[in-house]
């Protein structure tokens, strides 16, 4: 018994005066607590606790279940204990089969012994299976067997407490270890869509998926810069042992413009927190914005190809797209496709492929697109660079020789006279009148130039060349004169020579 100094409160004394007592099943247990301020006896084994207010604890016929710690406490709160083993060959273990272990922590397999003198107190796998190689344990006959640093891999491990009695191995009832995982990473959060675009009155519904090792992960939807509690609904699933999924769905049944903003799905566990955001934009009506990918004024050489390309944003989805030229709709030569296959995509591309353009195909090409709310259009002015074409070459009633040429850029007309039957026209003739005409006849983009010279200046047989040229090329036409007496006569224009 402990010795104490006089005057100081001392713990009670117990008879018999030893720390451990072994009795046989059926024998009497008699324990006496001596203390002037005796309060109570307490008996503890596993989760069971009993009290006795008498200073002598008597169990007439001891059973294995009377094995445990008997503690006497006085009025000063001081106590003394004795551990009693009730040896029962038929019941070597007292068991509490509930067995939970937190990952990376120690856990106790509660199978205290009724006989401390048995040997080889340890753990064994069920049905003869070996225990995991890395499983370490410490046996304690009074408490059970402590498994050190529980691993996630031990989850659902079936095991027995085991002792050797008289050379034979005796097993306890089986235990199933349930491992509670430790949070070793932040929760994984994802959102059904990163952004939402809605019209007023439409329903906004967004789902956040939270994944973690257990259901004790916390999650909530928050609106950035707002403390308002949001209405959310939950669904959850366990996919296997350490794969928990929760879906938190936020709904606004009739969205308004002022509901626009950033919504955050927040989740945390003991390791840390994670979040993901989605952006809601609510517009009062749909829209279409068109962005030309090339200059809307296009210069292209005769015979070359050009692609007219636009990108456009359309919400709601575009319903009708068309390319128009000269009030006629293209049925082919164009394609329209979404910029991305993303479900929330509102950006589209339309391409008109113009191949081997002719000078007559310059003009305004218009892209039109509409959805249920709006229409939009963009026009491209296409100028086809063409070498001059001589439209007409006439001798007028007033004696003028008139040459009209069309091309782009604007042609220049020069005049030359070749006397007699010479092949080379070198003597230049100054025009009397040069005009750039309004292009009502030839198509858009071509510029028409009309130049005139006075044919009365020519006194000899010969050929007059009208030469039209620009940056792209040159073209000539010839007018042949022959004099018959005093009359000047035009003779067959292509009979004189080939230019």
């Amino acid at each position: 018994q402990p010795s104490v100094s006089p005057g100081e409160p001392s713990p009670p004394s117990i008879h018999p005066g030893k720390s451990d007592l072994i009795v046989r099943v059926g024998d009497e247990i008699r324990l006496l607590c001596t203390d002037p301020g005796f309060v109570k006896w307490t008996f503890e084994i596993l989760d069971e606790t009993n009290e006795n207010k008498q200073n002598e604890w008597i169990t007439e016929k001891a059973e294995a279940t009377n094995t445990g710690k008997y503690t006497c406490t006085n009025k000063h709160g001081l106590s003394n204990s004795i551990y009693v083993f009730v040896r029962d060959p038929a019941k070597l273990f007292l068991v509490d089969r509930s067995l939970y272990g937190k990952e990376d922590n120690d856990t106790l397999v509660r199978c205290p012994l009724t006989d401390p003198e048995v040997t080889n107190y340890s753990l064994k796998g069920c049905q003869g299976k070996p225990l995991p190689k890395d499983l370490r344990f410490i046996p304690d006959p009074k408490a059970g067997i402590m498994i050190k640093s529980v691993k996630r891999a031990y989850h659902r491990l079936c095991l027995h407490c085991s002792v050797d009695q008289e050379g034979k191995s005796v097993l306890s009832e089986k235990f199933i270890l349930k491992v509670r995982p430790a949070f070793k990473a932040v929760p994984v959060v994802s959102v059904s869509k990163a952004s939402y675009l809605l019209r007023e009155g439409e329903e906004f519904t967004v789902t956040c998926t939270i994944k973690d090792v257990s259901s004790s992960v916390y999650s909530t939807w928050k609106r950035e810069n707002s403390q308002t509690k949001l209405q959310e609904k939950y669904n959850s699933w366990h996919h296997g042992d350490f794969n928990y999924e929760r879906q938190a769905t936020l709904t606004i049944s009739s969205a308004r413009v002022n509901d626009s903003g950033v919504f955050m799905c927040y989740a945390n566990n003991t390791f840390g927190s994670a979040n993901v955001t989605t952006t809601l934009e609510v517009v009062d009506k749909g829209f279409i914005n068109i962005f030309p990918m090339i200059n809307t004024t296009v210069f292209v050489n005769d015979g070359e190809n050009v692609d007219l390309i636009v990108e456009y944003e359309a919400f709601p989805k575009p319903e009708h797209q068309q390319w128009i030229y000269m009030n006629r709709t293209f049925t082919d030569k164009w394609e329209d496709y979404p910029k991305s296959e993303n479900e929330s995509n509102i950006r589209y591309v339309s391409e008109l492929h113009l191949t081997r353009l002719k000078g007559t195909e310059g003009g305004t090409y218009t892209f039109l697109v509409s959805n249920s709310d709006v229409n939009a259009a963009i026009a491209f002015n296409v100028y086809v660079n063409t070498k001059p074409e001589i439209l007409t070459y006439d001798r007028l009633v007033n004696g003028m020789l008139q040459c009209v040429a069309a091309g782009f850029p604007e042609p220049t007309i020069d005049w030359y006279f070749c006397p007699g039957t010479e092949q080379r026209c070198s003597a230049s003739v100054l025009p009397v009148d040069v005009q750039t005409l309004n292009s009502s006849g030839p198509p858009f983009g071509k510029l028409v130039v009309q130049s005139s010279i006075d044919s009365s200046a020519f006194k000899h047989n010969g050929t007059v060349e009208c030469k039209a040229y620009n940056d792209v090329g040159k073209t000539s036409a010839y007018f042949n004169f022959a004099f018959k007496g005093n009359n000047k006569e035009q003779i067959h224009p292509h009979t004189l020579f080939t230019p």
């Epitope: 074409e389 006439d394 001798r395 006849g441 007018f479 292509h494």
Partner: antibody
């Protein structure tokens, strides 16, 4: 000598298509603009279309614009007229004709083919 | 207006002179050309420019112009001259050629 020979015309139902061709010889085909002119039964001459000497430019009468296409193949010395969405009023003898002045698109027509009859009737 | 107007029919005694006329605004500036068309045949150019004849066209055919009127004259008409005659000129406000309605010449 200059010769222009049109292909056989034929009968077509309204809304259908027909293609005429005109084979040229006796001159430098690639130097001259070529025209199509038509003449409805018992009526006068009506200019239809022209293609410039190199085929880079085409012009049409308002009555056929958007339905008829003139083209040429200088390597084959052949002129074509593709007639789509035919109407009863397109019934006529179709002549191909050569421009008189080398390199000039519009002007007098100095040689004509013998003509081919196109009948549009249901 | 881009129209050329011709008398529908003219007759002439064999060997006499006949004049066919063509009226239109474009003729104030541009010369008319004239085409002869016999039944079942293609048109043939007979006069172009101020008064020019393609090779093979007899010199009894001549052209003239005054104001908005162009004329085709046959001096000493022959039986083979019986045909339809079309005048042709540049369209005002355009470049293509337009044709008159045609004159039917009968040689008596």
């Amino acid at each position: 000598q200059v010769q222009l020979v049109e292909s056989w015309g034929g009968v077509a139902q309204p809304g259908r298509s027909l293609r005429l061709s005109c084979a040229a010889s006796g001159f430098t085909f690639s130097s001259f603009a070529m025209h199509w002119v038509r003449q409805a039964p018992g009526k006068g001459l009506e200019w239809v279309a022209v293609t410039s000497y190199d085929g880079s430019n085409e012009y049409y009468a308002d009555s056929v614009k958007g339905r008829f296409t003139i083209s040429r193949d200088n390597s084959k010395n052949t002129l074509y007229l593709q007639m789509n969405s035919l109407r009863a009023e397109d019934t006529a003898v179709y002549y191909c004709a050569k421009a008189m002045v080398r390199g000039v698109t519009f002007g007098d027509l100095d040689y004509w083919g013998q003509g081919t009859l196109v009948t549009v009737s249901s | 207006s881009s129209e050329l107007t011709q008398d529908p029919a003219v007759s002439v005694a064999l060997g006499q002179t006949v004049r066919k006329t063509c009226q239109g605004d474009s003729l104030k500036s541009y010369y008319a050309s004239w085409y002869q068309q016999k039944p079942g045949q293609a048109p043939v150019l007979v006069i172009y420019g101020e008064n020019s004849r393609p090779s093979g066209i007899p010199d009894r055919f001549s052209g003239s112009s005054s104001g908005n009127t162009a004329s085709l004259t046959i001096t000493g008409a022959q039986a083979e001259d019986e045909a339809d005659y079309y005048c042709c000129s540049r369209a005002t406000g355009g470049y293509h050629r337009i044709f008159g309605g045609g004159t039917k010449l009968t040689v008596l």
